[in-house]
């Protein structure tokens, strides 16, 4: 059973976590950010399911793409530049919140996203857990 | 850590088939659809095609239509080339790349030499 | 289909140099260009994507540019690993299709 203390350290890595996904949404979503209708277009997978630490297996799978599509944007008017640095940070979060121990095929659901809309789901998945912790 | 390894050298003779494997390992195989190019002696790059693993999709160069077949087993991460009615100009090292949009081609296998000679 | 035409086909430079390469798509396929390095005998490796941007581990010295039908890869400040052949690849459409590359030598 989860202790007290186990809990809360969960509790503060999903806030971590969902500090960096809303950095990342309001850089991109950033007016100075020229880069913002060609990343647009890239379709990100959403996961069919998401309600549990191990569904974070399906945002892992979609960092790389992502650290990609934000490398389109790094300049010197847009503030995310250490991309490399901020997906290596979210990748350890998850890794660790996710549990290595069962690896889950991730499901993901037919229609595809746009990076807004991928990382709205993923802070509302956070959102979600956290209120539960609470 | 990503990789593509392909299946061995081999050696056919005009008229006949290869089928040269692919196997990805290191990322969830059916997000990222994969490429083939191959490349003659001293001569440069040429796309033949690519497929989707999760819909299991293909789209094939004008050039290779009727005689390429792309095809893959998610069950164990691996697509698969099939060049039939080979001939002497088909020799060349055959290439998988991994490739998502605009993202281009990431990660490339290692590449597999296929000799025609009668 | 689109025909990507790469110039100059063959370029000899010293270490140090400032080298341009030009890849010209006869329609327009907005920034869906990349640039790839291959050695003898190896597989080749991608430099730039999106017209001008570096995955991860590329050396800085690297740099692309251009949109529409006119694009360029630089390579600031030639290193003795930098002598290889370089294609750019359109990724816009289907069929996908490679300049003919441009072999770099060392002068």
């Known amino acids: 059973a989860p202790t007290s203390s186990s809990t809360k350290k969960t509790q503060l890595q999903l806030e971590h976590l969902l500090l960096d996904l809303q950095m990342i949404l309001n850089g991109i979503n950033n007016y100075k950010n020229p880069k913002l209708t060609r990343m647009l277009t890239f379709k990100f997978y959403m996961p069919k399911k998401a309600t549990e630490l191990r569904h974070l297996q399906c945002l892992e799978e979609e960092l790389k793409p992502l650290e990609e599509v934000l490398n389109l944007a790094q300049s010197k008017s847009f503030h995310l530049r250490d991309t490399k640095d901020l997906i290596s940070n979210i990748n350890v979060i998850v890794l660790e919140l996710k549990g290595s121990e069962t690896t889950l095929m991730c499901e993901y659901a037919d229609e595809t996203a746009t990076i807004v809309e991928f990382l709205n789901r993923w802070i509302t998945f956070c959102q979600s857990i956290i209120s539960t912790l609470t | 850590q990503v990789q593509l390894v392909q299946s061995g050298a081999e050696v056919k003779k005009p008229g006949a088939s290869v089928k040269v494997s692919c196997k990805a390992s290191?990322?969830?195989?059916?997000?990222?659809?994969i490429n083939w190019v191959r490349q003659a002696t001293g001569q440069g790059l040429e796309w033949m095609g690519w497929?989707?693993?999760?819909?299991?999709?293909?789209g094939y160069a004008q050039k290779f239509q009727g005689r390429v077949t792309m095809t893959r087993n998610t069950s164990i991460n691996t697509a698969y080339m099939e060049l039939s009615s080979l001939r002497s100009e088909d020799t060349a090292v055959y290439y998988c790349a991994r490739g998502r949009q605009w993202l281009g081609f990431d990660y490339w296998g290692q590449g597999t030499l296929v000799t025609v000679s009668s | 289909d689109i025909q990507m035409t790469q110039s100059p086909s063959s370029l000899s430079a010293s270490v140090g140099d400032r080298v341009t390469i030009t890849c010209r798509a006869s329609?327009?396929?907005?920034?869906?260009l990349g640039w790839y390095q291959q050695k003898p005998g190896k597989a080749p490796k991608r430099l730039i994507y999106a017209a001008s941007t570096l995955p991860s581990g590329v050396p800085s010295r690297f740099s692309g540019s251009g949109s529409g039908t006119e694009f360029t890869l630089t390579i600031s400040s030639l290193q003795p690993e930098d002598f290889a052949t370089y294609y750019c690849?359109?990724?816009?459409?289907?069929?996908?299709?490679f300049g003919q590359g441009t072999q770099l030598e060392i002068k």
């Open positions: 290191g990322y969830t195989f059916t997000n990222y659809d």
């Open positions: 329609q327009d396929i907005e920034h869906d």
């Open positions: 497929m989707n693993p999760n819909s299991g999709n293909t």
């Open positions: 690849l359109q990724h816009n459409s289907f069929p996908r299709s």
